[in-house]
């Protein structure tokens, strides 16, 4: 009798619990910006404040007949999604509605912020528990809903946003590309993109993670018992919505930061067909799909990281990328990847007080990624060491040299554009533990962190025969920190981190002409959280 | 993620014909006008105007009631539709394009975006 | 399996209070609805209210609101049906029924509890 | 409230031959987002509560033997017996569950002729 979206999402030993805060109550809010609701279906009922908050655009057409199931029918299923008492993921939850999208589901970007700043308003003069704002609607980019975003995430507020519905780079959309916002694209009952018509889900770095959107069995409008099924994006940012409702009623202290990365972390892995994004998408869309997390006091203080995608640089010279964490982590690695293999490396810098990762594009490249690798890292003191280049033929060699600091990442730079003269650097974990090596022309960044009980190790994979890439995981218990490919092939596309594994990709033309000898390498740094022990290095 | 991507940016540093006032002569523009890449989902005539982060509260009234005297003065009725204080300051204004080049030469301007559709998914 | 076991046959005065009881067994007792209907000797069925055990939330037929409460408790999965001051009108068979939400309707009931008010 | 009006009020049939029952709801009971008619017939036999036979209309609840079927739409409806048996010798009710408060019909008596 479980609709398999709610088995989807919600493990097993999830279903029949409650979530409430420490004292009893369920104190979470959670503000849905949509059309007007059906306020008195059985699902929500006593659950759901209606504000009187309406800013929507007339409806278009002189033959327009308001008809109030319709007028309420995105909206109530979305509410019942999120805190329906039969369907809802979160199903004690409180919710207010405000009415932003009209009677054919059009809505305006200022109509949206001034939704936004009513919620804002509402927090100052009533500061109640935590606020979740679920946005299931997309226009254009918009740099100003996106500011309106980020500014609310700032108060504490945790935003989830429709990836929207136009097959598309959810990047080029609104507020879905906004990155304090908690991104959500649509999967069905197979774990697959949703298709929707001719278009579906979108897709890309924007896209946090999956949820259930398709054939989502939910409260519909038409009458006080009457149920339906919906799909799309905004279906599936319900979902979300729920689940984040679901574990800040458990613990309200968890901050944005802390729920994306549980977020990520506890969701099922590697199940969506990639095949189905355009190929230059595929390894920027997430391989996500929701589920329930546990609480940390089930899980204990593990490390938790992600990766971050910068926009691509763009094919100019000189172009750079830039890939920012968000305020409350850290940076523990940067890596590049160019699908044409021209790039002259990454680098750590900071940018006012925050640590960015950067890449850089080489003559002649069709331009650059850069790839952060953010993670959570409680009362860390991180700090960037670096070389310049050496001399020719000579190694550069950077250690983390404080004491007590543990090397999480290296990024390697080269100075000259032209490929063929230099070599790749190279990590060399047996001879030199704890540090970043690099050859002729590269200036050398290694990323140091000290932090209670961090440890981390490197792990190495080589791969003398032809491969497009070579991967090495982080065991159980580790955390990948830092990505490399190291030297092998006369050309490398670089390397990047997908969830606990480490992926160095090789250009084809060099596959052809490696000799067995010139193994190309990919070099993880794992890292755990053991808060007893002492920071160190693992051999 | 928030990178300015398929989105249209133009410079609007018109120059100024601002009635010979010192203050408005003396200030070019160096604020942008944005706005949605999907012409279809533009609403032209509609306009948010977003001041910078430190510009205060007085400030932001101040600004909006200066646009309506400028337009004013050159025969345009302006309406202005909202105030923004709590997210950012700003304020949303019904007005003529004709009207963007002075509008981003007010002072505090950092950007204006014209207004468009958000649809539900 | 599951059911719905409702307590025994009452006997009463008019004016006295009556809590009579819909224990469920064997499904999530807090993620499906009880509902209550009368049944009066000879007569059809009535619909008199609904609780959501989860939340206890409650729905009433306009004619027993005011009549009758609904309540639950969820740590022992037992609704109930309760009268502060009977009359011989009340006189009725109750059933307690499970609704299935998605179809909403009575899929499971209990056995019935007939109550008798009479001096 | 949406009343809900049963014809006949008794109904007598031979064994084997068709029993069919009639229900009318004052307001129509199909809604279109998901095109179902929110209506359900249930069978009462003498001293046991009431079994559910159909929903959504016509669909059997599982278990129910095929000679019920139930039809209509929107404010009409039908439950059709197609061979009388001597167990279905029971009073029928249809109900409505689209809205709160929910209602029967004053209930159909099938006897056998």
């Known amino acids: 009798s479980i609709p398999w979206n709610l088995e989807r999402i919600i493990p097993a030993w999830h279903q029949t619990e409650e979530d409430r805060s420490p004292d009893g109550s369920s104190q979470v809010e959670v503000y849905l910006l949509d059309t007007s609701i059906q306020g008195a279906h059985r699902e929500i009922e006593g659950r759901v404040t209606i504000t009187d908050f309406n800013s929507v655009p007339e409806e278009d057409g002189t033959r327009f007949h308001r008809q109030a199931s319709k007028c309420d029918s995105h909206g109530t299923h979305l509410a019942g999604v999120v805190s329906g008492r039969d369907a809802g993921v979160a199903k004690g939850t409180s919710l207010h509605s405000l009415r932003v999208l009209n009677c054919q589901g059009k809505g305006t970007v200022s109509g949206t912020l001034i939704g936004l700043e009513f919620i804002r308003k509402s927090q100052l003069i009533q500061p109640s528990g935590p606020l979740v704002v679920l946005l299931p609607l997309a226009g254009g980019y918009s740099r100003i809903l996106n500011a309106a975003c980020r500014h609310l995430a700032r108060t504490g507020v945790v935003l989830v946003a429709a990836a929207g519905n136009f097959r598309d780079d959810a990047c080029l959309y609104s507020p879905a590309s906004a990155p304090e916002v908690i991104t959500v694209g649509a999967t069905n009952a197979q774990d697959q993109p949703v298709t929707l018509g001719t278009l579906g889900t979108n897709f890309g770095r924007c896209v946090d993670l999956f949820a259930p959107g398709k054939d989502i069995i939910g409260a519909s409008s038409d009458c006080s018992t009457c149920f339906m099924s919906q799909s799309g994006t905004s279906q599936a940012a319900a979902h979300v919505a729920g689940i984040v409702a679901r574990m800040l009623s458990r613990e309200p202290t968890l901050t944005l930061a802390e729920l994306r990365q549980r977020l990520i972390h506890f969701s099922t892995k590697d199940v969506i067909n990639m095949a189905w994004f355009p190929e230059d998408q595929q390894v920027l869309t997430p391989n996500l799909v929701a589920t329930l997390p546990p609480s940390t006091h089930e899980t204990g203080g593990q490390l938790l990281c992600r990766t971050v995608w910068s926009a691509h640089s763009g094919p100019t010279r000189t172009a750079t990328a830039t890939a920012r964490c968000a305020p409350e982590e850290e940076l523990l690695s940067c890596s590049s990847f160019s699908r044409s293999g021209r790039r002259r490396g990454d680098w750590i810098e900071a940018i006012g007080g925050q640590q960015v990762c950067k890449a850089l594009n080489a003559f002649g490249g069709e331009g650059v990624y850069a790839v952060a690798r953010c993670c959570l890292v409680p009362r860390a003191n991180c700090s960037i060491h670096n070389t310049p280049a050496a001399r020719a033929g000579l190694e550069t060699h950077v250690h983390c040299h404080q004491k007590d600091h543990v090397l999480t990442g290296c990024s390697f730079h080269w100075e000259v554009e032209d490929l063929s003269v230099r070599r790749q650097p190279a990590l060399r974990s047996r001879r030199q533990p704890g540090q970043c090596v690099g050859h002729q022309a590269a200036s050398v960044y290694a990323s140091c962190c000290h932090a209670p009980g961090l440890e981390c190790k490197i792990k190495e994979h080589g791969i003398s025969g032809p491969s497009e890439q070579v991967t090495v995981a982080c065991e159980a218990g580790w955390t990948l920190t830092g990505c490399n490919v190291l030297p092998g092939a006369s050309l490398t596309l670089g390397a990047y981190s997908v969830d606990n594994l480490c992926v160095a990709r090789v250009h084809d033309t060099a596959r052809a002409d490696r000799t067995s000898g010139e193994a190309t390498v990919a070099a993880a740094i794992c890292c755990r959280s053991r808060p007893s022990a002492k920071a160190s290095w693992v051999q | 993620q928030d990178e300015d991507g398929d989105y249209e940016e133009l410079m609007l540093a018109l120059p100024s014909q601002e009635d010979g006032l010192a203050d408005e002569a003396a200030h070019v523009a160096t604020a942008t006008f944005r706005r949605c890449s999907k012409e279809a989902w533009r609403l032209p005539g509609t306009y948010i105007v977003v001041l910078m982060e430190e510009t205060q509260r007085l400030q932001i009234e101040q600004t909006a009631h200066r646009l309506q005297t400028r337009a004013a003065r050159r025969g345009y009725v302006i309406k202005v539709l909202h105030i923004f204080y709590d997210l950012f300051p700003g304020f949303l204004v019904k007005m003529s394009s004709d009207l963007l080049g002075l509008a981003l030469k007010l002072p505090h301007v950092e950007y204006i975006e014209e207004d468009s559709f958000v649809f539900a998914q | 399996q599951v059911q719905l076991v409702q307590s025994g046959a009452e006997v009463k005065k008019p004016g006295e209070s009556l809590k009579i009881s819909c224990k469920g067994s064997g499904y999530s007792f807090t993620n499906y609805w009880i509902s209550w209907v009368r049944q009066m000797p000879g007569k059809g069925l009535e619909w008199m209210g609904i609780i959501y055990p989860g939340d206890s939330y409650t729905n009433y037929s306009p004619s027993f609101q005011g009549q009758v409460t609904i309540s639950a408790d969820k740590s022992i999965s037992t609704a109930y049906l309760q009268w502060s001051s009977l009359k011989a009108s009340d006189t009725a068979m109750y059933y307690c029924?499970?609704?299935?939400?998605?179809?909403?309707?009575?899929?499971?009931w209990g056995q019935g509890t007939l109550v008798t008010v009479s001096s | 409230d949406i009343v809900m009006t049963q014809s006949p009020d008794s109904l007598a049939v031979s064994l084997g031959e068709r029993a069919t029952i009639n229900c009318r709801s004052s307001?129509?009971?199909?809604?279109?987002?998901?095109?179902?008619?929110?209506l359900a017939w249930y069978q009462q036999k003498p001293g046991q509560p009431p079994k559910l036979l159909i929903y959504?209309?016509?669909t059997r609840e599982s278990g129910v033997p095929d000679r019920f079927s139930g039809s209509g739409s929107g404010t009409d409806f039908t439950l059709t017996i197609s061979s009388l048996q001597a167990e279905d010798v029971a009073v029928y009710y249809c109900q409505q569950y689209s809205s709160f408060p929910i209602t029967f019909g004053q209930g159909t008596k099938v006897e056998i002729k």
């Open positions: 029924a499970r609704d299935y939400w998605y179809k909403p309707l009575f899929d499971i």
């Open positions: 959504w209309a016509s």
């Open positions: 307001q129509s009971v199909l809604y279109s987002s998901n095109n179902k008619n929110y």
